[in-house]
C-alpha cells in the first residue's frame, strides 16, 4: 500500500463545529488483495516540524481515510498551541497519517507509508458561504500533485470535493471534471467525484500526465468555471531488463602508448529503460563483475560503472531512462615490454529486476597490449647563444611518440665527448616524457674552444633497461658580453620594459630578459611581466627546469604571497594578474598593480597607503603598504 500524495492541505477555522469532515486521504494498492487501514500519528506539529501537542482535535476513519474534526478548535486552544511553537508565529499545523501496518518509525514520515496533512489556521470563524470565491469553493490553496506506481492495480487516488465547504455550504452546487485526451487512463466519477486509474500504468510509456481539473460552481443563477493543473507522476519500478544499444556487446581496444594506471582502455554501454534503483543505491544493486581469467588479467584491469540518466521518446513524450557505461580501466602501469592479447568478460546484473527474462548481460572486451620500442632520431642539431644564462631552455629531445606516452617512464641522459665543454644538462618533463635541454654551466659556454659541443643522448626505460641513443651537435653562437652591474638574478624583479630588456636573468637563452606586454583587460592571464623567455615563462605551469631555481620564473613557481589584484595559480604562481606583475623571489613575494602609475604619482603614493579594491580589480582585496611599495623603486 502507498499514499497517492505525500502531503495534503486544508483550512481550519476557529470554532469550526465538531463533526466537520475535513478531507480524504487515499491509498493505492501494490497487490490486489491489499486493504488499506489508516491511522493518525499521536501529535500535532508546528513550524520546523516541532511537536506542539497531542492531537486531541482531529480523527480519521480507519477504513475510508476520512479526516474529521472530533472537537472544535477554540481560540484558547490555538493560543496554547501557538505558545509552544518555539517563539515563531503559528500559521500552519500538520499531523501524520500512517498506513497500517507500517515499518516506519513513528518519528519519521516518509512516502510511501506516511503522508503529512497540513492545516492552515485562520483566526476567524468559517466565512459566510456567499462570501467564498469560486476558487475557494473548488480547490485547496495548494495545488495537489499525485504519485502513482507503475504496474500496480488501478484504484481511487483523489476526491475532488472540499468537504468543509460541502458540509457548511450545502446549497452551493459544485461539479468537477477532468480535461484529458482520448485514451488516458483516468476517470472522474460524476457522482462521488472520485478520481481513479482505469488500468495499471506503464512509466516507460508515459511518466507525467499534465491533466487539467475543471470545476463548475452553481450558486443561484450564477455559474462560474475554475481550472487548475492536475499533474500525475508515474513512479518507476525495475521492470525493464538491461540491453545493449544497437546490439553492441563487444569492444576491442589496443593498449600501446597509454599505459598509465586509471587509463580507460574501452567502454561498453548498457541501456536500461528504468530509472531505479535510485542513484544512492545504484552501484550496490546494479553490479558488474570482471569474470575470473588469469591472474595477470585480474591484476591489470578493473571495470568501472558510470551510470547516467538520459531521456528517450515514447508515445510522443519523453521519459527518463538510464545508460550505464562500463569502462575497462588499467589497474596498474603496464611495462613497455608487455605483449599479449586477451578476451575479458564482464557480468552485469540488474539485481532488482524481477523478470520476465533475465536481468543479466555479458560484456566482452578484446584487448591487445602491444610492446613499445624506444627510438630516437639518428641525430639532433641545435644552437645556443654564448650569452645564454644558466637554466636557459634551448631545446627538447623526445623518443618516437613520446608526446602520446602516459605511464611510460623515460629518463634522458647526456654524455659529453669533451669533458671541459660539458655545458648542457637534460631533465625529463613529467608532462610529455620529453627531455628538456638547458644550460647548466655558463663558464664552459664562454670558452672559445667550446664552439661545438658533441653529446650522446641516451633515453632509458629503467623498468625494462631498454635504451635508445642519438648524437647531439650543439653550435655555440655569438660573443659573450658582460652584463651591466646591478642587474637582479631574476628577470621577474623588473617592473618596466626598459629595465627589463637591459638585463639578463636566470633562464634567459639570449642573455637578455624579454618583456611580455599584457592585454590590459583587468585581472587577466596575459598580464605584463618580465621573463627570461616568453616561450616558457609565464605559461601558467612551473616546468621541470623552472623548479630548479625560484629565480627563473617565480610568476609560475612562487609559493609565497601575491599582493594586489590577482588569481592565484594551482598549486602555485600567478594564474592571472592585474596590470603588471613583478616578483622578489628571495622574499617570496609578487606584486600585481596597474601599469599607468608614473613615478611622481608613485612617489606620492608611497607616502600614503594604497588600496586596490575589489571593484577596481575584480579579484582579492589587498592593502599595499609603504613597506611593500619600496620594492617598486628597486631600479
Amino acid at each position: 500500500l502507498y499514499f497517492s500524495r505525500d502531503a495534503y492541505w486544508e483550512k481550519l477555522y476557529v470554532d469550526q463545529p465538531a463533526g466537520t469532515p475535513l478531507l480524504y486521504v487515499h491509498a493505492l494498492r501494490d497487490a490486489p488483495e491489499e486493504v488499506p487501514s489508516f491511522r493518525l500519528g499521536q501529535h500535532l506539529y508546528g513550524t520546523y516540524r516541532t511537536r506542539l501537542h497531542e492531537n486531541n482535535w482531529i480523527c480519521i476513519q480507519e477504513d475510508t481515510g476520512l479526516l474529521y474534526l472530533n472537537r472544535s478548535l477554540d481560540r484558547s486552544s490555538w493560543e496554547k498551541l501557538s505558545g509552544r511553537n518555539r517563539g515563531f508565529p503559528l500559521l500552519t499545523v500538520y499531523l501524520k497519517v500512517f498506513l497500517s501496518p507500517t515499518s516506519l518509525r513513528e518519528g519519521e514520515c516518509q512516502w510511501p507509508g506516511c503522508a503529512r496533512v497540513y492545516f492552515s489556521f485562520f483566526n476567524t470563524s468559517f466565512p459566510a458561504c456567499t462570501s467564498l470565491k469560486p476558487r475557494e469553493l473548488c480547490f485547496p490553496e495548494t495545488r495537489p500533485s499525485f504519485r502513482i506506481r507503475e504496474n500496480r492495480p488501478p484504484g481511487t487516488f483523489h476526491q475532488f470535493r472540499l468537504l468543509p465547504v460541502q458540509f457548511l455550504c450545502p446549497n452551493i452546487s459544485v461539479a468537477y471534471r477532468l480535461l484529458e485526451g482520448e485514451g488516458l487512463p483516468f476517470r472522474c466519477a460524476p457522482d462521488s467525484l472520485e478520481v481513479s486509474t482505469r488500468w495499471a500504468l506503464d512509466r516507460e510509456q508515459r511518466e507525467k500526465y499534465e491533466l487539467v481539473a475543471v470545476c463548475t460552481v452553481h450558486a443561484g443563477a450564477r455559474e462560474e468555471v475554475v481550472m487548475v493543473p492536475f499533474p500525475v507522476t508515474v513512479y518507476d519500478e525495475d521492470d525493464s531488463a538491461p540491453t545493449f544499444p544497437a546490439g553492441v556487446d563487444t569492444a576491442s581496444a589496443v593498449v600501446e602508448f597509454k599505459r598509465k594506471e586509471d587509463t580507460v582502455v574501452a567502454t561498453l554501454r548498457v541501456f536500461d529503460a528504468d530509472v531505479v534503483p535510485a542513484s544512492g543505491e545504484l552501484v550496490r544493486r546494479y553490479t558488474s563483475t570482471l569474470l575470473p581469467g588469469d591472474t595477470w588479467t585480474q591484476q591489470t584491469f578493473r571495470v568501472e560503472h558510470w551510470p547516467n540518466e538520459t531521456s528517450v521518446q515514447a508515445n510522443g513524450s519523453f521519459v527518463r531512462a538510464t545508460v550505464h557505461d562500463y569502462r575497462l580501466v588499467l589497474n596498474r602501469n603496464l611495462s613497455i615490454s608487455e605483449n599479449r592479447t586477451m578476451q575479458l568478460a564482464v557480468l552485469v546484473n540488474d539485481s532488482d529486476f524481477q523478470g520476465p527474462g533475465a536481468g543479466v548481460l555479458l560484456l566482452h572486451f578484446n584487448v591487445s597490449v602491444l610492446p613499445v620500442s624506444l627510438h630516437l632520431p639518428s641525430s639532433y642539431s641545435l644552437s645556443v647563444s654564448r650569452r645564454a644564462r644558466r637554466f636557459a631552455q634551448i631545446g627538447k629531445v623526445c623518443v618516437e611518440n613520446c608526446q602520446a606516452f602516459s605511464g611510460i617512464n623515460v629518463q634522458y641522459e647526456l654524455h659529453s665527448s669533451g669533458a671541459n665543454c660539458s655545458t648542457l644538462g637534460v631533465v625529463t618533463s613529467a608532462e610529455d616524457t620529453s627531455g628538456i635541454l638547458f644550460v647548466n654551466d655558463t663558464k664552459a659556454l664562454r670558452r672559445p674552444k667550446c664552439a661545438e659541443l658533441h653529446y650522446m643522448v641516451v633515453a632509458t626505460n629503467h623498468q625494462t633497461s631498454r635504451q635508445a641513443q642519438a648524437q647531439l651537435l650543439v653550435t655555440v653562437e655569438g660573443l659573450y658580453v658582460a652584463e651591466e652591474a646591478g642587474c637582479p638574478l631574476s628577470c621577474a624583479v623588473s617592473k618596466r620594459r626598459p629595465e627589463c630588456e637591459e638585463c639578463g636573468g636566470l633562464g634567459s637563452p639570449t642573455g637578455r630578459c624579454e618583456w611580455r606586454q599584457g592585454d590590459g583587460k583587468g585581472i587577466t592571464r596575459n598580464f605584463s611581466t618580465c621573463s627570461p623567455s616568453t616561450k616558457t615563462c609565464p605559461d601558467g605551469h612551473c616546468d621541470v627546469v623552472e623548479t630548479q631555481d625560484i629565480n627563473i620564473c617565480p610568476q609560475d613557481c612562487l609559493r609565497g604571497s601575491i599582493v594586489g589584484g590577482h588569481e592565484p595559480g594551482e598549486p602555485r604562481g600567478i594564474k592571472a594578474g592585474y596590470g603588471t606583475c613583478n616578483c622578489f623571489p628571495e622574499e617570496e613575494k609578487c606584486f600585481c598593480e596597474p601599469e599607468d602609475i608614473q613615478d611622481p604619482l608613485c612617489d606620492e603614493l608611497c607616502r600614503e597607503q594604497k588600496l586596490i579594491s575589489e571593484e577596481d580589480l575584480g579579484g582579492e582585496q589587498k592593502l599595499i603598504s609603504e613597506e611593500d611599495l619600496h620594492h617598486h623603486h628597486h631600479h
Epitope: T50, R51, R105
Partner: antibody
Amino acid sequence: QVQLVESGGGVVQPGRSLRLSCAASGFSFSSYGMHWVRQAPGKGLEWVAVMWYDGSNEYYADSVKGRFIISRDNSKSTLYLEMNSLRAEDTALYYCAREDWDEGYYYGMDVWGQGTTVTVSS
Amino acid sequence: DIQMTQSPSSLFASVGDRVTITCRASQDIRYDLGWYQQKPGKAPKRLIYASSILESGVPSRFSGSGSGTEYTLTISTLQSEDFAIYYCLQHNSFPWTFGQGTKVEIK
C-alpha cells in the same frame, strides 16, 4: 503494553566486568534509540549512554567513556551495556529507557524500565 | 557539556499550594528540556517535554514554560500524590544532562 526489563546486575569487584541487558516488548524496538541512565544510592539521575535505533551511532557520558560499551540486538529486541574496569563510583541502579525522537528532534526519554542494581565492592 | 542547575534543591509545601521549580542551563538549549517525577523505589516518569508539552495522561495542574536558558515547572494546585523528587533533563545535545533534583516534601 510497552515494557522494558533490565537484568544482569549484581555484586562485582573493582576492575572486573559486568554485562547488563534490557529486554523490550510492546513496541517496534528497532525503530527507537535506547539509553542507559543510572542513579547512585541517595543521589540524582545520571545519563550514561545512548545507541541509535539502527546501531549506527553511540554516545557516552565522560565518566564512562572508554570503559562502557552500549550495544543492541534488534532481532532480539534487547539493549546491552558492557561495563569494564568497574569502580566503586559505578555502584548504582541502572535504568534502560526509550528515546522519544520525532522529525529530527529529541524529546527525552518516554519509557523507563524498573532498573537493575550494580554494586562494585571488594 | 551543558550544565543544568536546578533550584531549589528541596522545598516544603502543603496540599493546594502552587509550587514552582526552576532549571537554568549553562547555554541556550532551545526549548529542549523535559521534567521528570520520581517517587521512592520507582523509575522516573516523564511529565513534560520540549519545555511545555504535557505528557499524555499527566494531570493538567502540571505545566512547563521557559526558553533559552531558563525553564520552570509549575504545579498549580499541589496534590498529595505530587510529593516526590523532580528532575529536569536537557535533551538538546549529547551528553544529555539532568539537574540535581528538587525534593518536594510535606510541610
